[in-house]
Interface confidence: medium
């Protein structure tokens, strides 16, 4: 990957697609400046991930400018809270991990105000991008779907996420060509059954998403964004 | 700023077809990911779900209006479109169209509603 | 089909109060819930998608909680700009509303 970006200073709200190793590059916001003081964490930011709602710590090298990078890595994927969080990060930039647009963390408040830029015309948006989860490396990683429908990509998309039981009649309302692509589909769902079970109401995907350290290779991950490429939508419930 | 608007011809026979029209701007139905909502509501009643059009022309109906709808799109002039085929005086309604975006979100952005009314 | 039931149709509360709007899945909806404001002139806007997330531009009085079947909006320090009907609505299959809770003030 290019490490053009890498003398790449970024400030609190920015608004970047970040690299982690065996993920997509996802969409992101800068949630803490690195402070010096803090050796782990010594040149690295804090990212907050879209989607999933997880953070995280990475350098300069693995974060890249949200709006120069996104017609390059804002295709839609099948990871886990992927599209949604493209979704949130264009029209909804100061989302916090708990859902409550609240007050900033102290590390963002000493930063001048951050206006995102006005993506795709979304006029309604806030000024700097606000606090985050303060969980870190709690994500699980999301397995590739072995099982995929006849076109090769895997449906799920909002108004069809929910499983079915193996035996449930199709829905009357679904695309035509989809009855003979569900038997493909059972058994893969936008969260994991125990997350959503035992999740917060606040925080219903927590625990989804690119972890801080994550041992999957780029290979399989770069074949896995290959096969991702144009999913169709949520049919798996 | 996303903006929806919706027309249509306002008054029609039963039995006959009604074609309304959703012109947006600030997003594109070209864009992945992105879907156009129609969604109506007769007069004292509540929202009633009816179509969903996509990007990639995948589409999705009520299951109870089905054999009636058809949606298509105009991508170039940024226009998403509703077809009933045979409106019946049931299909009273305001008609409003939304975007809504691939994943785990809701309908965002809502046109201002057109209403349709269906008289002899 | 999902059901999706609002049992309570309307609800008068008084200004500053704080008022929760329930509604119940016919299913198991796996947090797949959105809830909708509709104005007096019929002006529709998203609130809260994925059962607890603030849209963008809502106040933070609005919240949402939930899970399985059972789901809730509050809001926690009514205003005048509030007096609309809300909805709630399911995408885990397909789109679905519930039948809409009008608030009014007392």
């Known amino acids: 990957m290019s490490r053009s970006n890498r003398q790449k200073e970024y400030k609190c709200g920015d608004l970047v697609f970040a690299k982690m190793k065996g993920y997509p590059h996802w969409p992101a916001r800068i949630d803490e400046m690195p402070e010096a003081a803090v050796k782990s964490t010594a040149n690295k930011y804090q990212v907050f991930f879209f989607g999933t709602h997880e953070t995280a710590f990475l350098g300069p090298k693995d974060l890249f400018p949200y709006e120069e990078s996104k017609e390059k890595f804002g295709k839609p994927n099948k990871r886990k809270g992927f599209s949604e969080g493209l979704w949130e990060i264009e029209n909804n930039p100061t989302v916090k991990a708990s859902g409550y647009q609240s007050s900033q963390k102290k590390s963002c408040a000493a930063e001048p105000e951050v206006e995102p830029e006005d993506h795709e015309g979304d006029g309604d948006k806030k000024g700097s991008a606000e606090g985050s989860s303060d969980e870190e490396g709690k994500l699980v990683i999301d397995e590739p779907a072995k099982e995929k429908n006849e076109k090769g990509t895997l449906k799920r998309r909002a108004g069809d996420v929910l499983e079915d039981s193996p035996k449930r009649p199709k829905e009357s309302g679904d695309h035509e060509e989809e009855d003979k692509e569900i038997a493909a589909l059972e058994g893969e769902r936008p969260l994991p059954v125990e997350v959503e079970k035992n999740s917060t109401p606040s925080e219903p995907d927590s625990g989804q998403g690119p972890p801080a350290e994550e041992e999957e290779g780029e290979e399989e991950a770069a074949k896995e964004e290959a096969e991702a490429q144009g999913v169709r939508d949520h049919e798996s419930l | 700023q996303i903006t929806l608007k919706q027309s249509g011809p306002g008054i029609v026979q039963p039995s006959q077809p009604v074609r309304l029209t959703c012109t947006f701007s600030g997003f594109s139905l070209s864009t992945s990911g992105i879907g156009v909502a129609w969604i109506r509501q007769p007069s004292g009643k509540g929202l009633e779900w009816l179509a969903t059009?996509?990007?990639?022309?995948?589409?999705r109906y009520n299951p109870s209006l089905k054999s009636r709808l058809a949606v298509s799109k105009d991508t170039s002039n940024n226009q998403a479109f509703l077809n009933i085929i045979t409106v019946e005086t049931a299909d009273t309604a305001i008609y409003y169209c939304a975007q809504i975006y691939d994943y785990a979100v809701g309908f965002a952005y809502w046109g201002q509603g057109t209403l349709v009314t269906v008289s002899a | 089909d999902i059901q999706m039931t609002q049992t309570t149709s309307s609800l008068s509360a008084s200004l500053g109060d704080r008022v929760t709007i329930s509604c119940r899945a016919s299913?198991?909806?796996?947090?797949?819930l959105n809830w909708y404001q509709q104005k007096p002139d019929g002006t529709v806007k998203l609130l809260i998608y994925?059962?607890?997330r603030l849209h963008s531009g809502v106040p933070s009085r609005f919240s949402g909680s939930g899970s399985g079947t059972d789901y809730s909006l509050t809001i926690s320090n009514l205003e005048p700009d509030d007096i609309a009907t809300y909805y709630c609505?399911?995408?885990?299959?397909?789109?679905?509303f519930g039948g809409g809770t009008k608030l009014e003030i007392k």
């Open positions: 299913q198991d909806i796996s947090n797949y």
């Open positions: 994925y059962t607890s």
């Open positions: 609505q399911q995408y885990g299959k397909l789109w679905t």
């Open positions: 059009i996509w990007w990639d022309d995948d589409n």
